[in-house]
């Protein structure tokens, strides 16, 4: 190796200056005794190199690039060798930004996978390899005092979410949770969440069904629908409230919301609808009165109201 580049910093803030030095060893005897060292950034020759011969006979060229505006580029020092440029050494330069504070951190507890899934927004592009780590600890109180640390959760590349498995969770006990972002230019941390995994539980929705007509029960009135639902069994012991939404299958009508319904209602007569009309219905539930997240909407149930003109317009519960 005849030449060697050293730089003030291989990674800098975008737009910052960078200084580089290229030294050519004296024992490269096949070279011109007073060679002219050239600099190139990417494909472009860079003027402004200051060259000197050092006391030990080596040649040194120093260049300052006033603004590195490329997020990634190769800086090389070279010599003219005949009609071609002979590259002596090159280094990769990177420029970008320190990570912004991750924001909108939120978590939900999935009881089926037994994991706490947290997601966040990473903020603007840094142009540098940036790692995110979901950090957490158990706390007896309101997260002012830190208990046992929980193993860091590292998302897969490019993902802004991470799952903490059940073995690291304690239900009905608070956890402090935050995201740390780190790259070569700095570290940032999101505001800390303090939560009990059960308070962010997201249940599966019930399954909507048509109510089986029983011989003794009156048929639904015109403009009414009779439906029932089967709760998601693993969430059955969690107090919940639910809501229905419905809209005619045809046309551009928006969803109409009906609720809150107690999960235990299990059957419902929905009235005040258009006669002889096909409707799409869905249901969702949330842990209540304790905190939780709404479930997704259930798969749709499609039902048709009876032919005759409606006689009354009200919502009515049947337990």
């Amino acid at each position: 190796e005849c030449g060697h580049i050293s730089v003030s910093a291989p990674i800098v803030h975008l737009g910052d200056p960078i200084t580089a030095s290229c030294i050519i060893k004296q024992n490269c005897s096949h070279l011109d005794p007073e060679p002219q060292i050239l600099w190139r950034l990417g494909a472009e020759l860079q003027p402004g190199g200051r060259q000197q011969r050092l006391s030990d006979g080596t040649q040194e060229s120093i260049i300052t690039l006033p603004h590195l505006n490329h997020t990634q580029a190769f800086l090389s020092c070279a010599l003219n060798w005949g009609n071609s440029l002979q590259i002596l050494d090159q280094v990769e330069l990177r420029a970008g930004y320190p990570p912004a504070i991750p924001h909108n951190l939120s978590c939900l507890m999935n009881l089926t996978t037994s994991s706490l899934i947290c997601q966040w927004e990473p903020g603007p592009e840094t142009h540098l390899p940036t790692s995110f780590t979901l950090k957490s600890f158990k706390s007896r109180g309101n997260c002012q005092t830190q208990g046992d640390s929980i193993l860091d959760c590292v998302p897969k590349d490019g993902q802004s979410h991470c799952s903490i498995p059940r073995k690291h969770l304690l239900l009905y006990q608070n956890m402090g949770i935050w995201v740390q972002a780190e790259n070569a230019l700095g570290t940032s941390m999101s505001p800390q969440l303090c939560l009990d995994p059960m308070d962010v539980v997201k249940l599966e929705p019930p399954m909507l069904r048509t109510m089986d007509p029983s011989p003794e029960a009156a048929p639904p009135q015109a403009g009414c629908l009779q439906l029932s639902w089967e709760p998601w069994q693993p969430g059955l012991h969690i107090n919940q409230k639910c809501e229905l939404r419905h809209k005619p299958q045809r046309g551009e009508a928006s969803w109409a919301l009906v609720g809150p319904l107690p999960l235990e209602a299990l059957q419902y007569e929905l009235c005040g609808l258009l006669p002889a009309t096909a409707y799409t219905l869905q249901i969702r539930c949330i842990r209540w009165p304790l905190p939780g997240h709404w479930s997704d909407w259930s798969p749709s149930l499609e039902l048709r109201t009876t032919e005759r003109a409606p006689t009354h317009h009200h919502h009515h519960h049947h337990h």
Epitope: S114, K167, L171, Q233, P234, L236, I238, E264
Partner: antibody, heavy 118, light 107 residues
């Protein structure tokens, strides 16, 4: 402190009836599912029935379905088990218990013994 | 219905021993598995809920693990007061089934 106190057990003839009660204190009774679990002499635990917080959902074990009825009176903080058409195999200590959100039983009452024998 | 197979049905151990009891469900039950301790003439007492959560007031020598179909209750160092019968219970769906029990006796 959460407390559950069963009563109503005793000796009854096959085919007879008995009503067990469980008085609850120390928690908001109306917010929790409750349940009955029994244990025959020298045997393991067997779930009998549960009831939702407002009483609308009442699952039963196949072995008691159609014969036992679970109910609750939230104004009295009391859980009941009406047992009809009793059989010798219903002989057991009957425990009432509060159900946790993910279906565990805690705490349990001290139990009341039901003996079905002629 | 979900069947719970608990093993062993009984075991003899000494104070200080590490004891492991297993429960196998006939189908996947996520983490909906609870463990109880019962002493003669007493009501059962909850030890572990949702497979691995230690109930308040239960000594940390008790731990639970597993998910899906296979679950384990471990007592890291058996104490004299731990000699009792232990039951697992599934709460994924009705009926709420108990395992057959494991009696831990003094060797």
């Amino acid at each position: 402190e959460v407390q559950l106190l069963e009563s109503g057990g005793g000796l009854v003839q096959p085919g007879g009836s008995l009503r067990l009660s469980c008085a609850a204190s120390g928690f908001t009774f109306s917010l929790y599912w409750m349940g009955w679990v029994r244990q025959a002499p020298g045997k393991g635990l067997e779930w009998v029935s549960s009831i939702s917080s407002s009483g609308g959902v009442t699952p039963y074990a196949d072995s008691v379905k159609g014969r036992f009825t679970i109910s609750r009176d939230n104004s009295k903080n009391t859980l009941y088990l009406q047992m009809n058409s009793l059989r010798a195999e219903d002989t057991a200590v009957y425990y009432c218990a509060k159900l946790g959100e993910l279906g565990w039983f805690d705490p349990w009452g001290q139990g009341t013994l039901v003996t079905v024998s002629s | 219905d979900i069947q719970m197979t608990q093993s062993p049905s009984s075991l003899s151990a000494s104070v200080g021993d590490r004891v492991t009891i297993t429960c196998r469900a006939s189908q996947g039950i996520s983490s909906y598995l609870n463990w109880y301790q019962q002493k003669p003439g007493k009501a059962p007492k909850l030890l572990i809920y949702y497979a691995s959560n230690l109930q308040n007031g239960v000594p940390s020598r008790f731990s639970g693990s597993g998910s899906g179909t296979d679950f384990t209750l471990t007592i890291s160092s058996l104490q004299p007061e731990d000699f009792a019968t232990y039951y697992c219970q599934v709460s994924w769906e009705y009926p709420l089934t108990f395992g057959g029990g494991t009696k831990v006796e003094i060797k």
